[in-house]
C-alpha cells in the first residue's frame, strides 16, 4: 500500500498496526488485560467501533472506506495501568491525483464494467489499478481486462463475477514515477449496480374476448426470486395519433408471470413490450422487443 502510517503513542507503545488488505487492526497483547476497545474516526468525525476478535488484541473493520483518511485508536486497560494509542492512516500522495468519478455496473447477468477518470492533478505517466475484495474478504480480484485512454487505465471489464458477494470493496491504486498517487476506494452493493436485461420469452395469446401476455423473469447476477421483480407492460395500439397516451401497466412478479386484459374481436393491431426492475429499487431495464398482435383491419 502507498499510504504511510504514523503512530501517535505514549512511551510504552501498544505497537498498533493496520493491514488494509484484511482491514485488520492489531496491537501487542498485554498481560492481565481487563478492558480493550478499538475504533476509527473519519474526517467527518464519524466513529466506527467493530467487535473485538476473540484474542482481544485485534479487530476487523467491515464496511469502511479509507480514501478520505482515518484515525484508528486503541484503548487497553490492564490490572496495572491503561494504554492508549492512535494510528493515523492518511491518503498520502498529491491531492487530486486519485481516480475520480468511479462507478460500476453489472449487465447481462454475469459481466461488469467499472469506469473512472484520471485525477485532475495526476501526472501524464499515472497508471491506475483496480482491486476488488468481497465482503467476506476471502478473495482479492485484480482487474483482468483494463479499458485504456492514451495508455492510462480508465476502466475495467470483468467477465467472471464468481468472486463477488452482495457487498464488495473496490480499491483503485495509482502509480507514477514523478509523484505519489492517492488511492480511491468504495463499497458497492451488487443489487444497486445491476442493470437487468428485459424479460424474455414474451408471448401474447388472444381469444375472442381477452389477450393473455406471458413472460419469463430476466436472468440476473443476484439470486433473485419471483417476488423481487416488478414489471411494466406497455400495451400500445398501432397507428394511433402522435402524442396518444400509452397504457403502462404495473405488474408484481409471480411464479407464473402473466397479464390478462379484455380485448374483444375484431381487434386492431397492438404491440406489447415489457421491462423489469428490482421491486425495491425500481431501476428499470430496457424494454423487450415489441410483440405485435391483432390485425390491421381490426
Amino acid at each position: 500500500e502507498k499510504s504511510d502510517l504514523r503512530t501517535v503513542a505514549p512511551a510504552s507503545s501498544l505497537n498498533v498496526r493496520f493491514d488494509s488488505r484484511t482491514m485488520n487492526l492489531s496491537w501487542d497483547c498485554q498481560e492481565n488485560t481487563t478492558f480493550s476497545k478499538c475504533f476509527l474516526t473519519d474526517k467527518k468525525n464519524r466513529v466506527v467501533e467493530p467487535r473485538l476478535s476473540n484474542n482481544e488484541c485485534s479487530c476487523t473493520f467491515r464496511e469502511i472506506c479509507l480514501h478520505e483518511g482515518v484515525t484508528f485508536e486503541v484503548h487497553v486497560n490492564t490490572s496495572q495501568r491503561g494504554f492508549q494509542q492512535k494510528l493515523l492512516y492518511p491518503n498520502s500522495g498529491r491531492e487530486g491525483t486519485a481516480a475520480q468519478n468511479f462507478s460500476c455496473f453489472i449487465y447481462n447477468a454475469d459481466l461488469m464494467n467499472c469506469t473512472w477518470a484520471r485525477g485532475p492533478t495526476a501526472p501524464r505517466d499515472v497508471q491506475y489499478f483496480l482491486y476488488i475484495r468481497n465482503s467476506k474478504r476471502r478473495r482479492e480480484i485484480r482487474c483482468p481486462y483494463y479499458i485504456q485512454d492514451s495508455g492510462t487505465h480508465v476502466g475495467c471489464h470483468l467477465d467472471n463475477l464468481s468472486g463477488l458477494t452482495s457487498r464488495n470493496y473496490f480499491l483503485v491504486n495509482g502509480t507514477s514515477r514523478e509523484i505519489g498517487i492517492q488511492f480511491f476506494d468504495s463499497l458497492l452493493d451488487t443489487k444497486k449496480i445491476e442493470r437487468f436485461n428485459p424479460p424474455s420469452n414474451v408471448t401474447v395469446r388472444c381469444n375472442t374476448t381477452h389477450c393473455l401476455v406471458r413472460w419469463k423473469q430476466p436472468r440476473t447476477y443476484q439470486k433473485l426470486s419471483y417476488l423481487d421483480f416488478q414489471y411494466q407492460l406497455d400495451v400500445h395500439r398501432k397507428n394511433t395519433q402522435p402524442g396518444t397516451e400509452n397504457l403502462l401497466i404495473n405488474v408484481s412478479g409471480d411464479l407464473e408471470n402473466r397479464y390478462n386484459f379484455p380485448s374483444s374481436e375484431p381487434r386492431a393491431k397492438h404491440s406489447v413490450k415489457i421491462r423489469a426492475a428490482d421491486v425495491r429499487i425500481l431501476n428499470w431495464s430496457s424494454w423487450s422487443e415489441a410483440i405485435e398482435f391483432g390485425s390491421d383491419d381490426g
Partner: antibody, heavy 120, light 111 residues
Framework: QVQLVQSGAEVKKPGASVKVSCKIS????????IHWVRQTPTKGFEWMGG????????VYAQRFQGRVTMTEDTSIDTAYLTLSSLRSDDTAVYYC?????????????WGKGTMVTVSS | QAVLTQPSSVSGAPGQRVTISCTGS?????????VSWYQQLPGTAPKLLIY???KRPSGVPDRFSASKSGTSASLAITGLQADDEADYYC???????????FGGGTKVTVL
C-alpha cells in the same frame, strides 16, 4: 397453478429418522428454491433451512445442524427433508415452501404440511 | 421463546382497524433485515401477506399494510372482516443465528 404436495403423516420412535417429501407441480423444481419450516404448539414456527444464494448451497439452522438433510430430485420435481435422531420434541407439522424472495426469506406458497409424531 | 416478540392476541369489531406489533433486535429487524408477515387460518398452511417490509403479493387485499422502523415492525388490518380471524406471524433474518426467525404469533379475533 403451482402446488406443493407433501407426503402423509408419520409416527416414529425416538432415535429413528423420518423422510418427508414435497412434490412440486405446475413448475420445474430446478428453477425454484425450497425451504423447510416446522410448527409446534409450544415453540411456534422454526425455520429449518434451505438454499442460500450467498453461500450457493443449502444451509441449515444451527439448532438442527448435523441432524437434518435437505435433498432434491429435479427429475421428478421432488424435495426431501430427512431428520434423524428424533426426539419427542420433534413432534411437529413440517412444511415445505417456495422462496418468493431470498430477503427474509419470504415464503410463498407453502405445502399443506406433514404431521410427524415422535412417541415411544 | 420466539426471537421476535408479538402480542398474543388483538381484537376488533368488523370494519375497525387493528395493528399487530413485532419487536426484534439489532441482529434481525434492526440490522436491518426485511420483515415478512403471514396469515394462518385454523388448520391450514401459512399464507404470505407482506414481504420486503411493506410489499403485498398479488391477491392480497390492500386492507393489509405494514411498516418497519428501527428494531420493530407492525401489520395493520383496516376494515376488519370476519374471515380475517386467524393467527398472524412476523418473520425476519437474524445474523447472530444465521437463519430466519419468526414471531410467536398473534391471534386476531373479530368481535
Amino acid at each position: 397453478q403451482v402446488q406443493l404436495v407433501q407426503s402423509g403423516a408419520e409416527v416414529k420412535k425416538p432415535g429413528a429418522s423420518v423422510k418427508v417429501s414435497c412434490k412440486i407441480s405446475g413448475h420445474s423444481l430446478s428453477e425454484l428454491s425450497i425451504h423447510w419450516v416446522r410448527q409446534t404448539p409450544t415453540k411456534g414456527f422454526e425455520w429449518m433451512g434451505g438454499f442460500d444464494p450467498e453461500e450457493n448451497e443449502i444451509v441449515y439452522a444451527q439448532r438442527f445442524q448435523g441432524r437434518v438433510t435437505m435433498t432434491e430430485d429435479t427429475s421428478i420435481d421432488t424435495a426431501y427433508l430427512t431428520l434423524s435422531s428424533l426426539r419427542s420434541d420433534d413432534t411437529a407439522v413440517y412444511y415445505c415452501s417456495i422462496v418468493g424472495s431470498f430477503s427474509g426469506p419470504a415464503l410463498r406458497p407453502w405445502g399443506k404440511g406433514t404431521m410427524v409424531t415422535v412417541s415411544s | 421463546q420466539a426471537v421476535l416478540t408479538q402480542p398474543s392476541s388483538v381484537s376488533g369489531a368488523p370494519g375497525q382497524r387493528v395493528t399487530i406489533s413485532c419487536t426484534g433486535s439489532g441482529s434481525n429487524i434492526g440490522a436491518p433485515y426485511d420483515v415478512s408477515w403471514y396469515q394462518q387460518l385454523p388448520g391450514t398452511a401459512p399464507k404470505l401477506l407482506i414481504y420486503h417490509n411493506n410489499k403485498r403479493p398479488s391477491g392480497v387485499p390492500d386492507r393489509f399494510s405494514a411498516s418497519k422502523s428501527g428494531t420493530s415492525a407492525s401489520l395493520a388490518i383496516t376494515g376488519l372482516q370476519a374471515d380475517d380471524e386467524a393467527d398472524y406471524y412476523c418473520q425476519s433474518y437474524d445474523s447472530s443465528l444465521s437463519g430466519s426467525v419468526f414471531g410467536g404469533g398473534t391471534k386476531v379475533t373479530v368481535l
